[in-house]
């Protein structure tokens, strides 16, 4: 009996009610592998989700996010609100990056400016909410008498490690 079911191809299910005949998946359901006893319900892309690929008898629907949102998780299981560059998402929505951090994307979290001194370099261009600092040559690399490219350090929030 098991062998009869294993002959059922993707897009069908082994119908116990009909002497284990291979029946096509009903509308809005699919089976992506052979030998299945039931078909899975198609995913529906509603609300903040939009359909990227329609469901077929052999494959599930694939969802994307509507404009202003982006996918999160495996197979776009969640849609997360986009923020502007220089912001990050919090419980209350999009908030500007704290001083000393930046985000150059519409998604994700604010990250600290690069610590130029870790590589023995100096800050060539100050960081902003949207952009990381640009590191330049170390102060020792500047020729004698040349003015330093390092701008004056801005005031910092408590907790931020100075560059």
């Amino acid at each position: 009996l098991q062998d009869l079911c294993s002959n059922c191809p993707a897009g069908t299910f082994c119908d116990n009610n009909r002497s284990q005949i291979c029946s096509p998946c009903p509308p809005n359901s699919f089976s992506s592998a052979g030998g299945q006893r039931t078909c899975d319900i198609c995913r529906q892309c509603k609300g903040v989700f939009k359909t990227r690929k329609e469901c077929s008898s052999t494959s599930n629907a694939e969802c994307d996010c509507i404009s202003g949102y982006h996918c999160l998780g495996a197979e776009c299981s969640m849609c997360e609100q986009d923020c502007k560059q220089g912001q990050e998402l919090t419980k209350k929505g999009c908030k500007d990056c704290c001083f000393g951090t930046f985000n150059d994307q519409k998604r994700g979290i604010c990250r600290p400016w690069t610590n130029c001194s870790l590589d023995g370099k100096s800050v060539l261009v100050n960081g902003t909410k949207e952009r990381d600092v640009v590191c330049g040559p170390s102060p020792a690399d500047l020729s004698p008498g040349a003015s330093s490219a390092t701008p004056p350090a801005p005031a910092r929030e408590p907790g931020h490690s100075p560059q």
Partner: antibody
Framework: QVQLQQSGAELAKPGTSVKLSCKAS????????IYWVKQRPGQGLEWIGN????????FYGEKFMGKATFTADTSSSTAYMLLGSLTPEDSAYYFC??????????????WGQGVLVTVSS | QVVLTQPKSVSTSLKSTVKLSCKLN????????VHWYQQHAGRSPTTMIY?????PDGVPDRFSGSIDSSSNSAFLTINNVQTEDDAIYFC??????????FGGGTKLTVL
């Protein structure tokens, strides 16, 4: 699967330093904050600071500026915390933890097993 | 400075319901997410509730989280308390997105 493996227990003398490690595996090390948290025996959790391994950028709690120094080695996916000028008050468990990149006020989804630092002469 | 205040200890009986509180001293409890961790003696914390009321995979549905803006507090409710729930529970939120804050922890004793 995601794991944060911390180094072993440390016994140190007052005035010396210890360097604790936190080796990450199972995810892209450079794309998540690593936080360091202190817990004195029988006490609460205290934020020490955090590092973004992608560029070495750091934040420190007011109380731990000058006490803790964070670094990260991306080649070995390991975060380090150097604790300097040790006193008996630094005797505690130290945990590293990862924060997801979902939101700026998110939880710590994975924790290291913790390392006990004992400062005694 | 933002402070999260938790009762030091709470005792409850087996199979009862207990509600642990976490009160924010200033600002609005709704401004940032609140998370809850469980810590057994000699172990690292594990997440029981994240983003106010979400439960990670593997955490029993006996655990739930809520926010009450009128008391400026977050709550962790445990239904049908079991002996393995005997642990310390910490709440966690933020002062700013670069400054996490923890409550002092509540030692839950199951009688």
């Amino acid at each position: 699967q995601v794991q944060l493996q911390q180094s072993g227990a440390e016994l140190a003398k007052p005035g010396t330093s210890v360097k604790l490690s936190c080796k990450a595996s199972g995810y892209t090390f450079t794309s998540y904050y690593i936080y360091w948290v202190k817990q004195r025996p029988g006490q609460g959790l205290e934020w020490i600071g955090n590092i973004w391994p992608g560029n070495g950028g750091t934040f420190y709690g007011e109380k731990f500026m000058g006490k803790a120094t964070f670094t990260a080695d991306t080649s070995s996916s390991t975060a380090y915390m150097l604790l300097g000028s040790l006193t008996p008050e630094d005797s505690a468990y130290y945990f590293c933890a990862r924060r997801p990149d979902y939101s700026g006020d998110d939880y710590f989804d994975y924790w290291g097993q913790g390392v006990l630092v004992t400062v005694s002469s | 400075q933002v402070v999260l205040t938790q009762p030091k200890s709470v005792s409850t009986s087996l199979k009862s319901t207990v509600k642990l509180s976490c009160k924010l001293n200033s600002g609005n409890i709704g401004s940032y997410y609140v998370h809850w961790y469980q810590q057994h003696a000699g172990r690292s914390p594990t997440t029981m509730i994240y983003r106010d009321d979400k439960r990670p995979d593997g955490v029993p549905d006996r655990f739930s989280g809520s926010i009450d803006s009128s008391s400026n507090s977050a709550f962790l409710t445990i239904n049908n308390v079991q002996t393995e729930d005997d642990a310390i529970y910490f709440c966690h939120s933020y002062d700013s997105t670069i400054t996490p804050v923890f409550g002092g922890g509540t030692k839950l004793t199951v009688l």
